[in-house]
Interface confidence: low
């Protein structure tokens, strides 16, 4: 609460998280023309990313494109995107949707449809929808570690959410156990009035936000973290805004002297943990 | 303005980016030996790297070392690294400036000079200019999308740049769409008054300031970001401090079982998202 | 000091690092059974990462596990893990601690001890002690260069810690050379009274604060920055609570058509350079 | 060192068939062509196909005569020309490229065969 003759100042933060957890994947793969069912095993270093600072990445979701080679091919036929001869496609051009380049011809993408011929990382990425339920659904039972150290420099004073008496083996309660820090990834959404069943498809932000209201003066001295949590992506965002969270990186090899890539489009869970407050003293 | 009545706090503040576009680089490639033109095209997974926050890095130029190997090699012959004798060099002496340690022989490096022999990833990182122009100068027409959810929680107080009236097919103008959260590379730097195609060489960091003036009141609410842009490195500096902005990363791999890595010395723009503002009350 | 007829404006600050460092591992290599002293050079390109902006890592110390692939198991005996039976293993298990998901089967770990099985990334990781001494020690040498732009918005004020009059082979000292923005790692642990080889065992967070307490009035003008070091991680964490600082990260390859990959533990030094201070102005 | 080896030229009457080969070695390439050149003529383009095998274009003088395929195992191209006119007589050159685009210019081919003699009779 406000205590007008105290000095206030704001809080310096630094903050370290480590996840946990493991997630067992289903999916269909393709190879050499048969498709079967398979299981594999993720673990923090396969769908988190080594990150500073007051965020972490968990990912959800993926699309993969497999032995990708840069050539030219047929762009993928999404909405508006299929042509019927050389006219419609315009040499040089770059649609921002699109993956690559146009050479101005108009090509087969299958038997039945032909779209603008471009040159890029061939075949393009298929434009299918991410998959439904998530892959990594089960990282609602990963668990986070935070650790935050304050200061304030004005008054010299620091202090830390884990204390020694502190129990490594807790999970925060927003009634139960409050001060812990090692939080369940889908009590946080539960907190937040959301479903993570539903936001690991697209992906989307979540904030984690740890408010230091503290009394420093020595005859009433208080410092400790209260956490909340709220959602900070638009869960009703238009398509054209880009909804959820999303990012596409490469894994990059040879293969018979040719440069391949495999494109991954990763959906997840960005965790902002957004510290503030202030330390007040006479 | 400033309303004396009011009770001011600052932001919070999560900001969320996705940059788009395509660039096709045209480079000199060597492969045994003979020199050809080689054309590529870069796409996001390419120029851009998975990265929290506020801050994004679009890769306009770069250097590639490929094929190295751990062993023995004369270093680079920079200004001041040439020897005539074994004198010269010191055994065990790392060299700032250098690669690698030095192993106290004076060697060969082609057939008018010679210098101190290394170990280092081999052959050593040539120190040549950043090519001009840049190799991703297209990247002024690449395209990013800033989304940024603000709070003010003593004020219990909630927005986010994007609007849903907002139309996703804008681009941001000072004067004719302000408001407009997708913005042209090129025309951050035209705001900022720089040279997009200078810069590009070298690399360097650019400031996008939203500023939130925020009246929270009722009866005078008011509450929507002002963007403005600033180059935040320094054009001017002593080449010692290192001008620009780059980055060494590599790309490991093995052949006939030796581990070998192509270094890629990445010149580029970071771009820096700086949030700043209050929320007033009464 | 505080001057009560100015109005005070915190400060929006860009930061920018760069390592500089070499350093000569030696370490076991076990090849073909056969285990022999292996010695590498690590550039800033091996033990550091593309970051942004208010934190850089430098790679001090690692552990790797080679050449696992998805398959079947038995975990490692840890502490608490061994079996005697199936009945001790429970078929969808997940243990925290453990690198994968048993299959209900008590099997052989080695010649005198029996563990659960899991569907995991195999060979699972050996729970072993980080290498003492830390592998790069060495980094204790290495330089990091930070510059700082910082701007006070509405006082319409810029200004960076590095000067045109700066000499780029300085070195920061507290007393000979306080305004020199290039640091010694080993330096900073010093100023902070930490000991560098000790922390670079098992890695820690050390925070750089730059504070800027600046008069922007003409008549008295001041505004460079001040920097001091402290150390961030708790060094007297219960093991539980994970002390240090490390992540896991890997490399994937194919051999044979499989999906391989290479499990790095790095521990290291992140340090967070975290920038205050006010403008104030009549 | 990049070698490219063209063979399956010769004699043939018109309305006949034949297949060109082209073995590449030393390098792979994005776009593979064909080129030809009659006597006291400039040398034109008759085909290319990129990495995808549907990946094909022809030239206009060509266009449902002939086809390219390629098959990356055997780092190999193939130019099945039917229905051959006298007007096809010349000599057949492969060409590799590394570009990606403008694949019908000659231009941005780097890497040439010695070229096969195509003669068709009346």
């Known amino acids: 609460s406000d205590k007008l003759y105290q000095r206030k100042e704001p809080v310096i933060s630094s903050v370290h998280t480590k996840v946990k957890g493991i997630a067992e994947v289903t999916e269909n793969v393709t190879e050499g023309g048969v498709t079967k069912l398979g299981h594999s095993i993720f673990d923090t270093a396969d769908y988190t990313f080594p990150l500073q600072g007051n965020s972490f990445f968990v990912m959800t979701n993926y699309v993969k494109s497999e032995g990708q080679v840069q050539t030219l091919c047929p762009e993928y036929p999404r909405r508006g995107a299929q042509c019927s001869s050389d006219r419609r496609c315009k040499k040089g051009w770059m649609d921002p949707q699109s993956k690559g380049i146009q050479t101005g011809r108009c090509v087969p993408y299958d038997k039945t449809r032909k779209t603008c011929e471009v040159s890029a990382w061939c075949p393009t990425e298929e434009e299918k929808e991410a998959p439904r339920p998530a892959l990594l659904r089960s990282a609602e039972n990963f668990t986070v570690l935070i650790k935050n150290n304050i200061h304030f420099p004005g008054h010299n004073y620091t202090t830390r959410n884990i204390l020694p008496t502190m129990n490594g083996s807790c999970t925060f309660h927003k009634t139960w156990d409050p001060q812990c820090s090692i939080f369940r990834l889908g009590d946080i959404f539960q907190e937040a009035g959301e479903n993570f069943t539903e936001v690991a498809v697209q992906g989307g932000i979540m904030g984690i936000e740890i408010y230091w209201d503290c009394n420093l003066d020595s005859w009433s001295h208080h410092c400790r973290p209260r956490y909340s949590f709220r959602r900070l992506d638009d869960k009703n965002m238009d398509e054209s805004f880009v909804p959820g969270y999303n990012f596409r990186y490469a894994k990059y090899y040879k293969e018979n002297n040719v440069e391949k890539r495999t494109l991954i489009k990763a959906f997840g869970i960005r965790f902002d943990i957004l510290v503030f407050g202030t330390g007040g003293k006479f | 303005s400033d309303k004396l009545y009011q009770r001011k706090e600052p932001v919070i503040s999560s900001v969320h980016t996705k940059v788009k576009g395509i660039a096709e680089v045209t480079e000199n490639v060597t492969e045994g030996g003979v020199t050809k033109l080689g054309h590529s095209i870069f796409d996001t997974a390419d120029y851009t790297f998975p990265l929290q926050g506020n801050s994004f890095f679009v890769m306009t130029n770069y250097v590639k070392s490929e094929g190295q190997v751990q062993t023995l090699c004369p270093e680079y012959p920079r200004r001041g690294a040439q020897c005539s004798s074994d004198r010269r060099c010191k055994k065990g002496w790392m060299d700032p400036q250098s690669k690698g340690i030095q192993t106290g022989r004076c060697v060969p490096y082609d057939k008018t000079r010679k210098t101190c022999e290394v170990s280092a990833w081999c052959p050593t990182e040539e120190e040549k200019e950043a090519p001009r122009p840049a190799l991703l100068r297209s990247a002024e027409n690449f395209t990013v999308l800033i989304k940024n959810n603000i709070h003010f929680p003593g004020h219990n107080y909630t927005t986010r740049n994007i609007l849903p009236t907002m139309n996703g097919s804008c681009t941001f103008h000072k004067t004719w769409d302000p408001q407009c959260s997708i913005f042209r590379l090129g025309d951050i730097f035209q705001e900022a008054g720089e040279n997009f195609t200078e810069v590009a060489v070298q690399g360097g960091i650019m400031g996008i300031e939203i500023y939130w003036d925020c009246n929270l009141d009722s009866w005078s609410h008011h509450c929507r970001p002002r963007y403005s842009f600033r180059r935040l490195d320094d054009k001017n500096m002593d080449e010692s401090f290192v001008p620009g902005y780059n980055f060494r990363y590599a790309k490991y791999y093995k052949e006939n079982n030796v581990e070998k890595r192509t270094l890629i010395k990445a010149f580029g723009i970071r771009f820096d998202i700086l949030v700043f503002g209050t929320g007033g009350k009464f | 000091s505080d001057k009560l007829y100015q109005r005070k404006e915190p400060v929006i600050s860009s930061v920018h690092t760069k390592v500089k460092g070499i350093a000569e591992v030696t370490e076991n290599v076990t090849e073909g059974g056969v285990t022999k002293l292996g010695h590498s050079i690590f550039d800033t390109a091996d033990y550091t990462f593309p970051l942004q902006g208010n934190s850089f890592f430098v790679m001090t110390n690692y552990v790797k596990s080679e050449g696992q692939v998805q398959t079947l198991c038995p975990e490692y005996p840890r502490r608490g893990a061994q079996c005697s039976s199936d009945r001790r293993c429970k078929k969808g298990w997940m243990d925290p601690q453990s690198k994968g998901i048993q299959t209900g089967r008590c099997v052989p770990y080695d010649k005198t001890r029996k563990t659960c099985e899991v569907s995991a990334w195999c060979p699972t990781e050996e729970e072993k002690e980080a290498p003492r001494p830390a592998l790069l020690r060495s980094a204790e040498n290495f330089t990091v260069l930070i510059k700082n732009n910082i701007h006070f918005p509405g006082h319409n004020y810029t200004t960076r810690n590095i000067l045109p009059t700066m000499n780029g082979s300085c070195t920061f000292h507290k007393t000979w050379d306080p305004q020199c923005s290039i640091f010694r790692l080993g330096d900073i642990f010093q100023e902070a009274g930490e000991n560098f080889t000790e922390v670079a065992v098992q890695g820690g967070i050390m925070g750089i604060e730059i504070y800027w307490d600046c008069n922007l009035d003409s008549w008295s003008h001041h505004c460079r920055p001040r920097y001091s070091f402290r150390r961030l991680d708790d060094k007297n964490m219960d093991e539980s609570f994970v002390p240090g600082y490390n992540f896991r990260y890997a490399k994937y390859y194919k051999e044979n058509n499989v999906e391989k990959r290479t499990l790095i533990k790095a521990f290291g030094i992140r340090f967070d350079i975290l920038v205050f201070g006010t403008g104030g102005k009549f | 060192e990049v070698q490219l080896v063209e063979s399956g030229g010769g004699l043939v009457q018109a309305g006949g068939s034949l297949r060109l080969s082209c073995v590449v070695s030393g390098r792979t390439f994005s776009a593979m062509g064909w080129f030809r050149q009659a006597p006291g003529k400039e040398r034109e383009f008759v085909a290319t196909v990129g990495w995808n095998p549907m990946n094909s274009y022809y030239g206009d003088s060509v266009k449902g005569r002939f086809t390219i395929f390629r098959d990356n195992a055997k780092n190999t191209v193939y130019l099945q020309m039917n229905s051959l006119k006298p007007e096809d007589t010349a000599v057949y050159y492969c060409?590799?490229?590394?570009?990606?685009?403008?694949?019908?210019?000659?231009?941005?081919?780097?890497?040439w065969g010695q070229g096969t003699q195509v003669t068709v009779s009346s």
């Open positions: 060409a590799g490229s590394g570009s990606l685009l403008d694949v019908t210019s000659e231009a941005v081919y780097t890497d």
